[in-house]
Interface confidence: low
Amino acid sequence: MMTGTIETTGNISAEKGGSIILQCHLSSTTAQVTQVNWEQQDQLLAICNADLGWHISPSFKDRVAPGPGLGLTLQSLTVNDTGEYFCIYHTYPDGTYTGRIFLEVLESSVAEHGARFQIP
């Protein structure tokens, strides 16, 4: 039975050209995390494997950094980075847990005037 829950940073916004940290946390389970996949829509951004460590997709290597922890740092943000991001926790024996984050990348002038999502 899957008892765990995924907490995420929820809906977040950031300025174009800036950086953002995507964070998920798995709680309420003693299952062992074997791997975490970070995906953007249908694209695999990065994998953190318990045995092999991090692997960043080569097409994102210039703009994606591993961590902190099992999170992911996106750098040099563009408006095209707006969208859904998923953290997919592969665990044993529970199975797969998925968390969702929505990122909106704003033009600097918009972001400065406080048009932001609230982080739950």
Epitope: L44, I47, N49, L52, G53, W54, H55, I56, P58, P66
Partner: nanobody, 117 residues
């Protein structure tokens, strides 16, 4: 000394197929991933596909559905099956691998693929 040796390149007609191989030797640790990049004349080197030691694969949008990457971990060898080749696939194809995460540690010398009628 670590070496990556590519083979399988050549001349093929549009719509044809080729299979590239990359044999890695000299590793103390098996590479955590192996992959393929390519460089067309007058263009920058671009990533094509990667395969992790655990079997996960992913591809550049330009080759999705046409190219398939695979690996034989016991032989430290990666393969790139290229189908439905187009003239724009003409390039020198380089094998690459990584032992520690974060950097592309090793490169092959490249193998030329020419797609032309």
């Amino acid at each position: 000394e670590v070496q990556l040796v590519e083979s399988g390149g050549g001349l093929v007609q549009p719509g044809g197929s080729l299979r590239l191989s990359c044999a890695a030797s000299g590793f103390t640790l098996s590479p955590s991933w192996m992959g393929w990049f390519r460089q067309a004349p007058g263009k920058e080197r671009e990533w094509v596909a990667s395969v992790l030691r655990g079997g996960y694969t992913w591809y550049a949008d330009s080759v999705k559905g046409r190219f398939t990457i695979s690996a034989d971990n016991s032989k430290n060898t990666a393969y790139l099956q290229m189908n439905s080749l187009k003239p724009e696939d003409t390039a020198v194809y380089y094998c690459a691998s990584e032992v520690a995460s974060g950097e592309t540690d090793y490169w092959g010398q490249g193998t030329l693929v020419t797609v032309s009628s």
